[in-house]
Interface confidence: medium
Amino acid sequence: LNTTVLQGMAGQSLRVSCTYDALKHWGRRKAWCRQLGEEGPCQRVVSTHGVWLLAFLKKRNGSTVIADDTLAGTVTITLKNLQAGDAGLYQCQSLRGREAEVLQKVLVEVLEDPLDDQDAGDLWVPEESSSFEGAQVEHSTSRNQETSFPPTS
């Protein structure tokens, strides 16, 4: 599964949209979790409403908000007031019982100060592909990676 690398500015909001097959994932809740390591579990940050028909309602945990458009097949996660500590590897997941199917892997990077490094334009160069592999972002730049990681729990 490809990993999309998204960059946001500290203090701003970062919005991630993970797309999925609406029919295949009919009735399933969605979750946003943080993968701590190769062997470790994915630590749940926030999940959509417990009643699937109400999944369009925003659910918040701290500064992270999730909402699911089940008809369009798009789950949207917003990281508000982005901080350096929010940087990390995350997953959009579709939940079925105790099983979690990974919809998208997202590596979040936080740019602390737009004026901090005048070579930032050289450092964060987008990959050749401009495709977001099913994840889109606002208020950020992004570079798409071809990373394939081993399965995680």
């Epitope: 390591g37 990390g88 602390e112 990959e127 990373t147």
Partner: antibody
Framework: EVQLLESGGGLVQPGGSLRLSCAAS????????MAWVRQAPGKGLEWVSS????????YYADSVKGRFTISRDNSKNTLYLQMNSLRAEDTAVYYC????????????WGQGTLVTVSS | DIQMTQSPSSLSASVGDRVTITCKAS??????LAWYQQKPGKAPKLLIY???NRFTGVPSRFSGSGSGTDFTLTISSLQPEDFATYYC?????????FGQGTKLEIK
């Protein structure tokens, strides 16, 4: 077992060039970001450069930007560091390291190769 | 760039002692911190990632804690093989900055 074996170090004059190699085995090389980290004699660790698993994006410390080039050949399971315009302050042991998922933490390291820049 | 400062720079202790090494970030880094151990003439080894997660094969006497700007590495009962230099490192945001190191010596 993960193994990283660096080579190519040696003595070079200021302004000269050197290419380091790192042969990787024991894991699917093409799935992982890789990096170079150096350590000057008696000093601490300094990250030098990283690149993505595809090699499509590269990252450099300010101290080497424009002089060093990181690259990889996934078909040969090998990581490279081309070092040009070498300075005395580049003298260090250079370690090749496997980086987990673009995180910047290095879970496996090579034994290092010494680069000495001196006239 | 965020700076990482370790204290103390060096530390003398005895086998069986409980030892704590601290690392301070110049800005909030959440839990994005790793710890490494390095013995003379050897490559560093990853001990702890994401503040408190022990890497594969790391003994349970090593533990990490903290959040934000202040972090600690604790060795609950020093063993002879633990005498080494320890480095903290800020992760997940380039440049990957290391602390200056803490040398743990035998008293």
């Amino acid at each position: 077992e993960v193994q990283l074996l660096e080579s190519g170090g040696g003595l070079v004059q200021p302004g000269g060039s050197l290419r380091l190699s790192c042969a990787a085995s024991g894991f699917t090389f093409s799935n992982y970001y890789m990096a170079w980290v150096r350590q000057a004699p008696g000093k601490g660790l300094e990250w030098v450069s990283s690149l993505t698993n595809s090699g499509g994006s590269t990252y450099y410390a300010d101290s080497v930007k424009g002089r060093f080039t990181i690259s990889r050949d996934n078909s040969k399971n090998t990581l490279y560091l081309q070092m040009n315009s070498l300075r005395a302050e580049d003298t260090a042991v250079y370690y090749c390291a496997k980086e987990w998922a673009g995180s910047g933490y290095f879970d496996y390291w090579g034994q290092g190769t010494l680069v000495t820049v001196s006239s | 760039d965020i700076q990482m400062t370790q204290s103390p720079s060096s530390l003398s202790a005895s086998v069986g002692d409980r030892v704590t090494i601290t690392c301070k970030a110049s800005q909030n880094v959440g839990n994005n911190l790793a710890w490494y151990q390095q013995k003379p003439g050897k490559a560093p080894k990853l001990l702890i990632y994401y503040t408190s997660n022990r890497f594969t094969g790391v003994p349970s006497r090593f533990s990490g804690s903290g959040s934000g700007t202040d972090f600690t590495l604790t060795i609950s009962s020093l063993q002879p093989e633990d005498f080494a230099t320890y480095y903290c490192q800020r992760i997940y945001n380039s440049p990957w900055t290391f602390g200056q190191g803490t040398k743990l010596e035998i008293k």
